[in-house]
Interface confidence: low
């Protein structure tokens, strides 16, 4: 069978599974005269043999873990033993079988985790090795937790990254672990080869002891601070502490106040920096943040609450320079004249703002002093001794002392004595007829003028007329403004008229005085008038129930998921057809009849959230009027973007030869959402073969350092693969390549002879 198992002498490669006893020859080389015999050299390990006639075979099972490639040479010799052909390279690749079990590097691991640590952030790695080929399932390891002790309510507090062996807290673990309740846990971890997918996989187990330590990064109790403190500032009011030394603290004022009177020092002590004023602001809420030296947040911010305690630092204030009341001549003892309402800026419902009223002077004192009483706490003025006579004293002036527990203020009240109110208002017309208006008549339009007259003393509360609509306008669409000089009433539109709900309204007005009528006089039919309002139909556009509709969904919802709905009604009762406008990404469709909105394509928060489209409601039939509203779809992040390099790192170089191991720093990012803390990536080399030459070490959640392990590099470009894991749910991993060139340098830059300028690196390390 020329070609497959026999043929002339030429370079060849053969693949043979390890662990198999020899069952056939490898190859039969044919000699070309003057060659008569063959000779085998190289990595034969006394396994590979060639017979003089050129038959290449092996005499016992191979072991890939001893040698994965045998580099052999075959030469053809003449009758004198002189090489006449070759030697040519013959490569034997030993193919892997699963003949090695994974083994943990340690039979017991110990670690600690702080309570409330971020879920998914590794705090310990277990590590197993398997001598089989990592490029095949035989050497691909799969870690899992066999048991967690203790297990409370069947809830797992710990999780393991199946591929990396990174142990972290679950969301429940982050919330519930408490060293006061349970300071230690034990995990049994298994590792399987074959990627954990085969019944024939080998496995090993290890034990992990975990100590839970207290998290001291906790929000302090709310602080109470007395306003207008005269103590020297700054004054320490509370403190926060990060779990380890060296954190950098700062305060974040979410309210963006023009004056933010708090500061934090490098020990985490929080100070008020100047006296506070409760009347300016009675409470503050701000955040304390701890960052590492690169300015990356170490954890979530803590909410700090400061309540400002009131002191009595505000006197009572009068409602106006002079408060004017009217009293009729014949009013009876005890009648209310009016209420003086003073104010106090101190805290409501406390002694600091509780007011007392006292009359300190009445002028004139005619016919006697003490004609008026004021209720001590309510401030209501009453007639105390007798009815008043306008011709004797038409006006009284009272000085009233208003006091809180520390301050006194004088307020001034003028009381005008007016004629008795013995005349009622009389409408000039009892019926103002019919008025026809279109339903889209502007708000604020005056639609009717009405007039009543009152024969009592002009420009007093006895003759002043107030008009009320007492019937026919339960929706409050109309109002009446009165001209104080003429008592003319102007009927105005306060709310839109509506043909659909009120086509005809029978309106009844009542005219009355602010002052009470004297005993025995009552309002009668003369004080009432009516008119009929007829509203005509105008075809109106549909009306949406909201100006903006908002919905929130996860960005990974299945196509066809209902993501929201809108509703509109047509005032005329016509059917409505819904449509979308501005769906630039083609993500959505709307049910024309129901207004339900569905996804029709994969959504992507990173393309922009919220996604804003317009919804259009159009009348079906009629004049097809339409109106527009907004639909805002807020997309909640899922971890769907693997980490990547934050910028282009082409052009990295080291000057060759290296005088000492070197390093460079690179930054990773991803497009997912990272609230407060920013990303927390973990970094590792992308393949095992890189580990002899390179080392990657994490600096912080986004930066890592790539270092050379030695100085013996060739003068060429190396492509270093880096594995970056985002620790998300699910964790996503990106493999990125950093091209690093080792080159001869002139004055710190890569030197290339003329004609070799392509791809010249530009950044030296």
């Amino acid at each position: 069978q020329e070609g497959k198992f026999s043929g002339p002498l030429k370079p060849m490669t053969f693949s043979i599974y390890e662990g198999q006893e020899p069952s056939q020859i490898i190859f039969q080389f044919k000699a070309n005269p003057p060659a008569v015999t063959f000779e085998l050299t190289g990595e034969t390990d006394n396994i590979f043999v060639i017979e003089r006639e050129g038959l290449l075979y092996y005499n016992r099972a191979l072991d890939r873990e001893t040698r994965s490639t045998h580099n052999l040479q075959v030469a053809a010799l003449d009758a004198n033993g002189i090489i006449v052909e070759g030697p040519v390279p013959i490569t034997i690749k030993v193919k892997d079988i699963n003949d090695n079990r994974p083994t943990f590097l340690q039979s017991k691991y110990e670690g600690s985790v702080r309570q409330n640590s971020r879920p998914g952030k590794p705090f310990l790695y277990v590590n197993a090795t398997d001598l089989d080929d990592p490029a095949t399932p035989n050497g691909q390891l799969y870690y899992q937790i066999v048991i967690q002790l203790p297990m409370i309510n069947n809830v797992m507090y710990f999780q393991i990254n199946n591929k990396t062996g990174a142990i972290s807290l679950t969301r429940e673990g982050s919330q519930e672990l408490n060293p006061a309740k349970n300071p230690s846990y034990n995990l049994v971890i298994s590792v399987k080869d074959m990627g954990g997918q085969s019944e024939n996989s080998f496995s090993d187990t290890t034990s992990v002891d975990i100590i839970v330590t207290e998290n001291i990064w906790k929000a302090p109790k709310p602080v109470e601070m007395v306003e207008n403190s005269t103590d020297p500032h700054p004054i320490k009011i509370t403190q926060v502490r990060w779990n380890d030394p060296g954190a950098q603290y700062s305060l974040v004022d979410k309210e963006k106040l023009p004056r933010f009177p708090f500061s934090i020092d490098q020990e985490g002590d929080i100070y008020v920096t100047q006296p506070l004023d409760r009347e300016e602001k009675d409470a503050y809420v701000f955040y304390a943040v701890a960052k590492d030296e690169y300015g990356k947040p170490l954890s979530y911010p803590l909410e700090i609450h400061v309540k400002v305690k009131d002191i009595n630092d505000n006197p009572p204030t009068c409602p106006s320079p002079v408060t004017v009341f009217e009293v009729q001549e014949n009013e009876r003892l005890g009648n209310s004249i009016g209420t003086l309402t003073a104010h106090d800026r101190d805290e409501e419902n406390t002694a600091n703002s509780f007011l007392n009223y006292r009359i300190v002077e009445q002028t004139p004192k005619l016919p006697m002093d003490g004609l008026f009483l004021i209720q001590t706490y309510a401030g209501m003025l009453q007639l105390a001794k007798q009815s008043l006579k306008k011709q004797d004293t038409p006006q009284y002036n009272l000085t009233i002392e208003v006091s809180d527990k520390d301050f006194k203020t004088l307020c001034f009240v003028q009381i005008n004595v007016i004629d008795i109110n013995d005349q009622i208002p009389i409408f000039e017309k009892s019926d103002y007829g019919n008025l026809t208006l279109a339903e889209d008549t502007n708000i604020g339009s005056t639609i009717l003028t009405i007039q009543a007259t009152d024969a009592d003393e002009p420009f007093t509360g006895s003759s002043k007329i107030l008009y009320h609509i007492i019937k026919g306008d339960s929706e409050g669409r109309l109002g009446v403004d009165t001209d104080p000089h003429t008592n003319t009433g102007y009927v105005i539109i306060k709310k839109p008229l509506d043909f659909e709900t009120a086509a005809v309204s029978n309106i009844v007005f009542k005219a009355e005085n602010p002052e009470p009528l004297v005993f025995g006089v009552k309002y009668n039919a003369s004080s009432f008038a009516k008119f009929t309002l007829i509203v005509t139909d105008v075809n109106e556009a549909p009306q949406f129930s909201q100006h903006v509709f908002q919905a929130k969904v996860s960005e990974d919802v299945a196509i066809g998921t209902k993501v929201g709905n809108v509703t509109a009604k047509d005032p005329e009762g016509l059917d409505i057809s819904y449509s979308l406008r501005g769906d630039t990404r083609g993500w959505l469709k709307i049910d024309h009849v129901t207004g339900e909105i569905f996804s029709v394509a994969p959504l992507d928060r990173e393309a922009g959230s919220p996604y804003r489209v317009q919804v259009v409601a159009t009348e079906v039939g009629g004049s097809s009027l339409s109106s527009v509203s907004e639909f805002h779809l807020i997309l909640m992040d899922v971890n769907d973007n693997p980490p990547r390099l934050a910028k282009d790192y082409t052009g990295l170089f080291f000057c060759h030869p290296l005088s000492a191991p070197g390093s460079l720093i690179f930054e990773a990012t991803d497009d997912d959402q990272h609230l407060f803390r920013g990303p927390h990536f973990t970094f590792s080399l992308g393949s095992g073969s890189l580990q002899n030459d390179w080392e990657v070490s994490k600096i912080n959640g986004t930066h890592a350092r790539l270092s050379t392990r030695h100085t013996e590099f060739e003068e060429r470009e190396y492509v270093v693969l880096i594995r970056i894991n985002d620790g998300g749910r699910p964790p996503l991993e990106g493999i990125v390549s950093l091209p690093v060139t080792f080159c001869s340098c002139v004055e710190g830059s890569c030197f290339r002879p003329a004609g070799h300028q392509t791809g010249i690196p530009t950044v030296g390390m």
């Epitope: 380890d244 950098q248 700062s250 933010f260 490098q266």
Partner: antibody, heavy 121, light 111 residues
Framework: EVQLLETGGGVVKPGGSLKLSCAAS????????MSWVRQTPEKRLEWVAA????????YYTDNVKGRFTISRDNAKNSLYLQMSSLRSEDTALYYC??????????????WGAGTTVTVSS | DVVLTQTPLSLPVTLGDQASISCRSS???????????LHWYLLKPGQSPKLLIY???NRFSGVPDRFSGSGSGTDFTLKITRVEAEDLGVYFC????????FGAGTKLELK
């Protein structure tokens, strides 16, 4: 007790070199940025150089850039100042100082006793 | 670089007196982050400098409350309410809003 102890000072000719060391004890050295500060014969204080916690970032005052190198060995709790091309104006008492990093502003809360460098022909 | 000018250069006092030292900066020390990085140190003969006040007015731990700092922008003051013997020495102001610099020092001595 928190302590910083400087060594390595001496008399050197202009153009010569000298390496100062500072041994830290009583605190977690790797948690703190460190600086060298000198006191001139006229009793003025001058900040010379600084280094961050892991040694990855260094800072220098303009008139020592290119001549002085600050470094640290966290495993040995030690800070160093390699001085070369020394000039007479470098004559001073050199203090090692622990800095609290206040964003981008430093103050020094622990100082050593100092070591004297004299540059003279 | 930012120049810090201290006045007076020498301040003779009687024990129990109040002392006041001024430090004026050639440019504002208010950082864009809202902090003002102006600090005060005391250097006593034969000793190393000691931190007294950081960020204008914050007393460092263990510093007696007779020491207080104040000021803003370019003008700053260190006050000692009742001078004691242990307070004698040279006081330096320092800024680290810009490249770190020190003032020339003020010598507090007995009359």
């Amino acid at each position: 007790e928190v302590q910083l102890l400087e060594t390595g000072g001496g008399v050197v000719k202009p153009g010569g070199s000298l390496k100062l060391s500072c041994a830290a004890s009583g605190f977690t050295f790797s948690n703190y940025g460190m600086s060298w500060v000198r006191q001139t014969p006229e009793k003025r204080l001058e900040w010379v150089a600084a280094i961050n916690r892991d040694g990855g970032t260094t800072y220098y005052t303009d008139n020592v850039k290119g001549r002085f190198t600050i470094s640290r060995d966290n495993a040995k709790n030690s800070l160093y100042l390699q001085m070369s091309s020394l000039r007479s104006e470098d004559t001073a008492l050199y203090y090692c100082a622990r800095q609290f990093l206040l964003w981008d502003g430093w103050y020094f809360d622990v100082w050593g006793a100092g070591t004297t460098v004299t540059v003279s022909s | 670089d930012v120049v810090l000018t201290q006045t007076p250069l020498s301040l003779p006092v009687t024990l129990g007196d109040q002392a006041s030292i001024s430090c004026r900066s050639s440019q504002s020390l208010l950082h864009s982050n809202g902090n003002t990085y102006l600090h005060w140190y005391l250097l006593k003969p034969g000793q190393s400098p000691k931190l007294l006040i950081y960020k204008v007015s914050n007393r460092f731990s263990g510093v007696p409350d007779r020491f207080s700092g104040s000021g803003s922008g370019t003008d700053f003051t260190l006050k000692i309410t009742r001078v004691e013997a242990e307070d004698l020495g040279v006081y330096f102001c320092s800024q680290s809003t810009h490249v770190l610099t020190f003032g020339a020092g003020t010598k507090l001595e007995l009359k």
